[in-house]
């Protein structure tokens, strides 16, 4: 089962998507793969059903700077 | 509340492109999910394709060929492009709103244009 | 033949409980993707029913209501009245296919 979350649509997924990723950008669909053309964007995922944090960060431009 | 009102020739010819408008009131379209959706004669719905503001589309696999869906900020508007029409494309055509507070469902339509494909 | 297979026509007397079902796959509703409902009057545009599974908005009477579970969902109306008779149509999104997909649609008839 999908993980419990919330979902997130309009203008309060992008401020929460500039939050998440804060100076490091985002994406709305990460490019496709040649084994997943048919990858799907952060609206479907985080709009049309429940989302966490994990899987908006997946989303952010750059990876987070480990410490 | 947001109000929407398709707009665009009722008569089309085989093989011309069909273009629609959308003008949205009482709302801003940099807020919102825009859709547009069809219904054949007597059939059910079909989506077609939705748009965010920032340039994020998506388009059904079977029209994603023929389909262009645009934004005009300054008029408030969003557009349809459907090229090579037939026969088969003949439908009531809605524009509709996701406005993110119903977890994407589209919550406002409009009332429907009828587009007839005919010579 | 929709992706989301609805039957193509109930009907119940006034007053009466029906169930309107909604079956999808392990890529739409069993994935985990909201079911939305939409009510369609005789020559009228859609009009959303229910959300997210079982949310009404504003204004629709609470003698709608949705449930999902696994791969299908299903809408229920009671106290059936006249004004009920219309189209409804099921919508969700479909991974396999990334894009959004309605039910082929069920024609509910109130009798009498």
């Known amino acids: 089962a999908y993980g419990p979350g919330e979902t997130l649509c309009g203008g309060e997924l992008v401020d929460t998507l500039q939050f998440v990723c804060s100076d490091r950008g985002f994406y709305f669909s990460r490019p496709s793969s040649r084994a997943n053309r048919r990858s799907r964007g952060i609206v479907e995922e985080c709009c049309f059903r429940s989302c966490d944090l994990a899987l908006l960060e997946t989303y952010c431009a750059t990876p987070a700077k480990s410490e | 509340q947001v109000q929407l009102q398709e707009s665009g020739p009722g008569l089309v010819k085989p093989s011309e492109t069909l273009s629609l408008t959308c003008t949205v009131s009482?709302?801003?379209?940099?807020?919102?999910?825009w859709s547009w959706i069809r219904q054949p004669p007597g059939k059910g719905l079909e989506w077609i394709g939705y748009f965010f503001y920032s340039g994020y589309t998506n388009y059904n696999p079977s029209l994603k060929s023929r389909v262009t869906i645009s934004v005009d900020t300054s008029k408030n508007q969003f557009s349809l492009k459907l090229s090579s029409v037939t026969a088969a494309d003949t439908a009531v055509y809605y524009c509709?709103?996701?406005?993110?507070?119903?977890?994407?469902?589209?919550?406002?339509w409009g009332q429907g244009t009828t587009v007839t494909v005919s010579s | 033949q929709s992706v989301l297979t609805q039957p193509p026509s109930v009907s119940g007397a006034p007053g009466q409980r029906v169930t309107i079902s909604c079956t999808g796959s392990s890529s739409n509703i069993g994935a985990g993707y909201d079911v939305h409902w939409y009510q369609q009057l005789p020559g009228t545009a859609p009009k959303l029913l229910i959300y997210?599974?079982?949310n009404r908005p504003s204004g629709v009477p609470d003698r709608f209501s949705g449930s999902k579970s696994g791969t299908s969902a299903s809408l229920a109306i009671t106290g059936l009245q006249a004004d009920d008779e219309a189209d409804y149509y099921c919508?969700?999104?479909?991974?396999?296919?990334?894009?959004?997909?309605f039910g082929g649609g069920t024609k509910l008839t109130v009798l009498g």
């Open positions: 509709a709103c996701i406005t993110g507070t119903t977890k994407g469902g589209m919550d406002v």
């Open positions: 919508q969700s999104f479909d991974s396999s296919l990334s894009g959004s997909v």
């Open positions: 997210g599974n079982n």
């Open positions: 009482g709302g801003s379209i940099s807020s919102y999910y």
